[in-house]
């Protein structure tokens, strides 16, 4: 057993079908000695008396809060929560995987540049009573300082018959060198609490492999004089890192007709402008990434021929 | 070319919720990135939201972040502004947006626009 904060603790439990549980000794917070009774949630039931309560914890219906009385006043409460281990593996009942980049993915993460500020999701199809709570840092030996905000509800998505609910946190390393090589990871740790049931997420990641660019600005494009080519250009995004001479974008350029079918032209650059071929209908995109460590593509910024 | 129909508008009182809802012409527009944003008499379109059918990547403008949720359904590809504890201060006409290229949060980055709604908060 072990607190989670004030006045929560954790039991772990191996969780098979006659499993023992655990013993898990409650103390009433209180000077008090004598007439001390112990009730369990809502019910009027007295469970045990004295300043000590020892309970065998064995299924969700031994958690809740326990809550030591004397003489109908209420002395202190403790609320118990259960972290499932079947097989030897930690359950992972209340987040969706992902299955990208991989499978077991809870967490993603993504970062717009190397200013140390990232955001990550996750996905639950749990409406109701629900919290979460995320800490992070660089290093977990010696660790340095990461400030996450409050976890939010960010979107729900109905995908055929099931109902799917995204949340997402903020973070930003306290002390970001965004020229620096990062030699130590960043850790992310996500509580997940559903009803009586913990569960606990990580992910591991340098900001690097977790870059994803804004998609190019400005995007305009120039015919040229008696031709049917025309010269697309734009701009870095606002967000991107400066200065551009060392942390620099390549770009893909892309000609993409109505059908999705037809075939698409793509033409690679580490400039900000390109000239290609506008055939009729068709639209051109444009998408970043970092020019000299292959971490995700932006999304697609784009403009039509006409 | 694609079209963006809003509906769902309409009067409230202030604490009160609604629910907009933008239904895109085609099927494949759910690939893009799309946006809400808001525009008040006498004053320049404002940012609302701005999220990635395909997840992750939601934001929201501070004056409304707690409050207002996007939800989207695949089948029927439509978007849904719901809007909760609304304040007499959120009272304008709201449009949906699809993204072209930019800033996530400028109207100038949307190429593609519906009619727009009305929503009135009353005090």
């Known amino acids: 057993i072990w607190e989670l904060k004030k006045d929560v603790y954790v039991v772990e439990l191996d969780w098979y079908p006659d499993a023992p549980g655990e013993m898990v000794v409650l103390t009433c917070d209180t000077p008090e000695e004598d007439g001390i009774t112990w009730t369990l949630d809502q019910s009027s039931e007295v469970l045990g008396s004295g300043k000590t309560l020892t309970i065998q914890v064995k299924e969700f219906g031994d958690a809740g809060q326990y809550t030591c009385h004397k003489g109908g006043e209420v002395l202190s409460h403790s609320l118990l929560l259960l972290h499932k281990k079947e097989d030897g593996i930690w359950s992972t009942d209340i987040l969706k995987d992902q299955k990208e980049p991989k499978n077991k993915t809870f967490l993603r993460c993504e970062a717009k540049n190397y200013s140390g500020r990232f955001t990550c999701w996750w996905l639950t199809t749990i409406s109701t009573d629900l919290t979460f709570s995320v800490k992070s840092s660089r290093g977990s030996s010696d660790p340095q300082g990461v400030t996450c905000g409050a976890a939010t509800l960010s979107a729900e998505r109905v995908r055929g018959d099931n109902k799917e609910y995204e949340y997402s946190v903020e973070c930003q390393e306290d002390s970001a060198c965004p020229a620096a090589e990062e030699s130590l990871p960043i850790e992310v740790m996500v509580d997940a609490v559903h009803k009586l049931k913990y569960e606990n997420y990580t992910s591991s990641f340098f900001i690097r492999d977790i870059i994803k660019p804004d998609p190019p600005k400005n995007l305009q494009l120039k015919p040229l004089k008696n031709s049917r080519q025309v010269e697309v250009s734009w701009e870095y995004p606002d967000t991107w890192s400066t200065p551009h001479s060392y942390f620099s974008l390549t770009f893909c350029v892309q000609v993409q007709g109505k059908s999705k079918r037809e075939k698409k032209d793509r033409v690679f650059t580490d400039k900000t402008s390109a000239t290609v071929i506008c055939r009729k209908n068709a639209s051109i995109s444009v998408r970043a990434q970092d020019r000299y460590y292959s971490s995700s593509w932006s999304e697609w910024a784009s403009v039509p021929c006409s | 070319e694609v079209q963006l129909v809003e509906s769902g508008g309409g009067l409230v009182q202030a604490g009160g919720s609604l629910r907009l809802s933008c239904e895109a012409s085609?099927?494949?527009?759910?690939?893009?990135?799309m946006g809400w944003f808001r525009q008040s008499p006498g004053r320049e379109r404002e940012f609302v939201t701005s999220?990635?059918?395909?997840?992750?990547?939601?934001y929201y403008a501070d004056s409304v972040k707690g409050r207002f949720i996007i939800a989207t359904d695949d089948a029927k590809n439509t978007v849904y502004l719901r809007m909760n504890s609304l304040k007499p201060e959120d009272t304008a006409v709201y449009y949906c947006a699809g993204y072209s290229s930019g800033s996530y949060y400028s109207p100038r980055s949307y190429g593609v626009w519906g009619q727009g709604t009305q929503v009135t908060v009353s005090s």
């Open positions: 999220f990635n059918w395909s997840g992750g990547s939601t």
């Open positions: 085609e099927r494949t527009f759910s690939t893009y990135r």
